[in-house]
């Protein structure tokens, strides 16, 4: 903590401006009024404060707002956001996408995945659901950030919003997240024709159940091996040799390349050798 001292009269601060960069930590602590700082937060980011000085300013705000900063302050945090911990952010109530955009821009290039994930979580909570505007903002300013949300938060995505999600936005999603997103995607794309449907649903297939994979095999989709390798092991295991053959089409030969890797390995071990032999790939169960 910064030691408390009295502010020298000549150092008294009446507005947040560039003169403050010459203040020592102790002087900032003594001379900057927290309420003034909060009221003029929009000026802070234009001033080249050192990280030490930013620590003091953060401390000021923490004292003024022990229950969490108001959005009027959060929106203008700028580089002060880099000083925030996930615990700090958890206290916030954020509803504005302008606030989200501003802070996502600041965080770019910094190792702040935990803070960004918490921020996005607070935005979703604040807005009540993961609506289209929020998803659009995330995909534009933070590709991959969608997957930082918990399955519980993702469950608030309406199916109508799924169309805004791009394949690269799902690259870092885990199985539990795809389990939540896949049924929404299936619903969102259900009226599309076979080939168009597959293009749209493919990034979400890591959450597909066995029955849907079997059904896909009826649509001549010729699934690529990269997509097949991302399928849930439990969903792949019950597929028959004929179903995998039909699902992969000409890509079935790729099973040989992947035969030592899950889920292919596990699937091979579950099949009768006679059935595997019909593929003519030399797969050994």
């Amino acid at each position: 903590d910064v030691e408390r001292t009295t502010c020298p009269p000549e150092k008294e601060v009446h507005e947040i401006d560039e003169n403050l960069i010459f203040y020592k930590k102790r002087e900032l602590e003594a001379c900057v009024d927290a309420a003034l700082l909060a009221a003029q937060m929009d000026r802070v980011d234009a001033i080249p404060f050192t990280y030490e000085q930013l620590d003091v300013l953060k401390h000021k705000l923490d004292e003024l707002y022990p229950q969490g900063y108001p959005e009027s302050v959060i929106r203008h945090l700028g580089h002060l956001f880099l000083k925030m911990s996930p615990e700090d952010i958890r206290k916030w109530n954020v509803t504005s996408l302008e606030t989200l955009k501003a802070l996502l821009k600041v965080s770019k290039g910094h190792e702040m995945s935990a803070q960004v994930a918490t921020l996005i979580d607070r935005v979703v909570v604040g807005r009540g659901q993961l609506d289209k505007d929020t998803v659009d903002t995330l995909t534009a300013f933070c590709p991959g950030c969608l997957c930082s949300l918990s399955p519980e938060r993702l469950s608030s995505v309406p199916p109508s919003v799924i169309g805004a999600v791009r394949p690269q936005d799902l690259d870092t999603c885990g199985p539990r997240q795809l389990d939540v997103l896949y049924p929404k995607a299936r619903l969102a794309f259900q009226n599309m024709s076979g080939s168009e449907y597959f293009v749209k649903i493919r990034p979400f297939l890591g959450g597909a159940p066995t029955e849907d994979l079997k059904a896909l095999s009826q649509q001549n989709v010729s699934m690529d091996l990269a997509t097949f390798m991302k399928l849930r092991r439990e969903a792949v295991l019950p597929l028959t040799v004929a179903e995998v053959q039909k699902l992969l089409g000409p890509h079935v030969e790729g099973l040989k390349v992947e035969e030592q890797h899950s889920p292919v390995r596990d699937w091979i071990l579950k099949q009768r050798q006679d059935d595997l032999d019909t593929l003519g790939l030399g797969l050994q169960g």
């Epitope: 029955e211 059904a215 001549n220 000409p250």
Partner: antibody, heavy 117, light 107 residues
Framework: EVQLVESGGGLVQPGGSLRLSCAAS????????MSWVRQAPGKGLEWVAT????????YYPDSVKGRFTISRDNSKNTLYLQMNSLRAEDTAVYYC??????????WGQGTLVTVSS | DIQMTQSPSSLSASVGDRVTITCRAS??????LNWYQQKPGKAPKLLIY???RLHSGVPSRFSGSGSGTDFTLTISSLQPEDFATYYC?????????FGQGTKVEIK
């Protein structure tokens, strides 16, 4: 050993309804798509309907779409075909068949449906 | 829909003969072509799937070949129990369709 036994066939008047059943044994019924295939007297084979292993997806040719409904009860290992608005041209032996990916690998003995006034 | 046309519609042959039945698809079906055998009053039985793979328990005198649109079922040495009707079926695209059948009779 895979066994499929159809029942429920019989004589029905045009416009009438009939429900066929197929009792399956010898394999894990809930793992497989199932189908109905029919054969008019002295004619060839015609695929009638297919249902996914969990019952979510159903497929029909245009000739029966809207009139026939395929369903299943996995707890009873039973496949069904509800046939409504029957026509004379629906007269056939109806076979229940297990469907694997792109072929019908096991068939029941069939049940005859006659549509006549 | 994909049309499947078999030829001949019927043929007469003797035990020990080599028999060939052809099946033509109206469009490319890759190798998703299956053959079934049906005896009078009985259900069809799967013989060959994916053009040339023998279903379990099917004798090796049965073989299949082809790809794309033209396919062949061959019985290398006809046996008494082989007199039956044979159907091809495409499994490439819904609706799945069958050929009209080829009846193999005793000469």
């Amino acid at each position: 050993e895979v066994q499929l036994v159809e029942s429920g066939g019989g004589l029905v008047q045009p416009g009438g309804s009939l429900r066929l059943s197929c009792a399956a044994s010898g394999f894990t019924f809930s793992d497989y798509f199932m189908s109905w295939v029919r054969q008019a007297p002295g004619k060839g084979l015609e695929w009638v309907a297919t249902i996914s292993n969990g019952g979510t997806y159903t497929y029909y040719p245009d000739s029966v779409k809207g009139r026939f409904t395929i369903s299943r009860d996995n707890s009873k290992n039973t496949l069904y075909l509800q046939m409504n608005s029957l026509r004379a041209e629906d007269t056939a032996v109806y076979y229940c068949a297990r469907f694997d990916g792109y072929y019908f690998d096991y068939w029941g003995q069939g049940t005859l449906v006659t549509v006549s006034s | 829909d994909i049309q499947m046309t078999q030829s001949p519609s019927s043929l007469s042959a003797s035990v020990g003969d080599r028999v060939t039945i052809t099946c033509r698809a109206s469009q490319d079906i890759s190798n998703y072509l299956n053959w079934y055998q049906q005896k009078p009053g009985k259900a069809p039985k799967l013989l060959i799937y994916y053009t040339s793979r023998l279903h379990s328990g099917v004798p090796s005198r049965f073989s299949g070949s082809g790809s794309g649109t033209d396919f062949t079922l061959t019985i290398s040495s006809l046996q008494p129990e082989d007199f039956a009707t044979y159907y091809c079926q495409q499994g490439n695209t819904l609706p799945y369709t069958f050929g009209q059948g080829t009846k193999v009779e005793i000469k």
